[in-house]
């Protein structure tokens, strides 16, 4: 079944279906799925020239 575009901002999609705590809503497939945690960048030591790349923890299984 074909679905129309949707945004990560939820601008043009209905509010995501509530998901259980270990899940989040995947706008691509319109479904609650297992979801890992985003890890924010760690501050670099003083004098470091560029921000650390953003990385992620492995998703929960």
């Amino acid at each position: 079944m074909r679905r129309g575009p949707r945004s990560l901002r939820g601008r043009d999609a209905p509010a995501p279906t509530p998901c259980v705590p270990a899940e989040c809503f995947d706008l691509l497939v319109r479904h609650c799925v297992a979801c890992g945690l985003l890890r924010t960048p760690r501050p670099k030591p003083a004098g470091a020239s560029s921000p650390a790349p953003r990385t992620a923890l492995q998703p929960q299984e």
């Epitope: 079944m1 575009p5 939820g10 995501p16 998901c19 989040c24 691509l28 799925v33 979801c35």
Partner: antibody, heavy 125, light 107 residues
């Protein structure tokens, strides 16, 4: 360890059928969406279909709609791609992949993180 | 369908070079873009997701940026193992579509 293993590829005549399998281990397919992506010889990647195994929702590329059917058996932790009315242009390596999600304000920030090794489908007379 | 246009289609570079690959979407895809690396005869490997997040285990010389329609993959210092083909992919709407690929070759 997360692993996806495809099987079922081979040589088939135009108009014929094949069924590809994607056996998953190290995670439960019902928690994710499973995708099939193909790559014709010397060409780029083309998404084929996806399924959310927990409820059976599916979607297909226009190029295969009506000919291919994606399905899943959660008890076997396996996804399938039934390919009918095969054409020469379906010749490709077929990969299955898991779409992973990271929580961005309870909305998925996702991509395909684990892929199988691929299985070659050749459609030729 | 949303079209993803990569440039260049191929490039030649040397070890240590800074390499930039761009991807342009035919419409706004927010930050729903991933980048993959593929070597001959192998399955693609995820590098970057959500436009700028480095996937677990990927070397920090890889970085991604962009939102809306314009996206960039940068390799800060090219290593011998980085010679491969790179693909962008949008997952803003179904069908998820890939760019045509950028082959990074040894100069």
């Amino acid at each position: 360890e997360v692993q996806l293993v495809e099987s079922g590829g081979g040589l088939v005549q135009p108009g014929g059928s094949l069924r590809l399998s994607c056996a998953a281990s190290g995670f439960t397919i019902s928690s994710n969406s499973i995708h099939w992506v193909r790559q014709a010889p010397g060409k780029g990647l083309e998404w084929v279909a996806w399924i959310t195994p927990s409820d059976g929702n599916t979607d297909y590329a226009d190029s295969v709609k009506g000919r291919f059917t994606i399905s899943a058996d959660t008890s076997k932790n396996t996804a399938y791609l039934q390919m009918n009315s095969l054409r020469a242009e379906d010749t490709a390596v077929y990969y299955c992949a898991r779409r992973v999600c990271y929580d961005r304000a309870r909305v998925c920030a996702g991509a395909m993180d684990y892929w199988g090794q691929g299985t070659l489908v050749t459609v030729s007379s | 369908d949303i079209q993803m246009t990569q440039s260049p289609s191929s490039l030649s570079a040397s070890v240590g070079d800074r390499v930039t690959i761009t991807c342009r979407a035919s419409q706004d895809v927010s930050t729903a873009v991933a980048w993959y690396q593929q070597k001959p005869g192998k399955a693609p490997k995820l590098l970057i997701y959500s436009a700028s997040f480095l996937y677990s285990g990927v070397p920090s010389r890889f970085s991604g940026s962009g939102s809306g329609t314009d996206f960039t993959l940068t390799i800060s210092s090219l290593q011998p193992e980085d010679f491969a083909t790179y693909y962008c992919q949008q997952s803003y709407s179904t069908p998820p579509t890939f760019g045509q690929g950028t082959k990074v070759e040894i100069k």
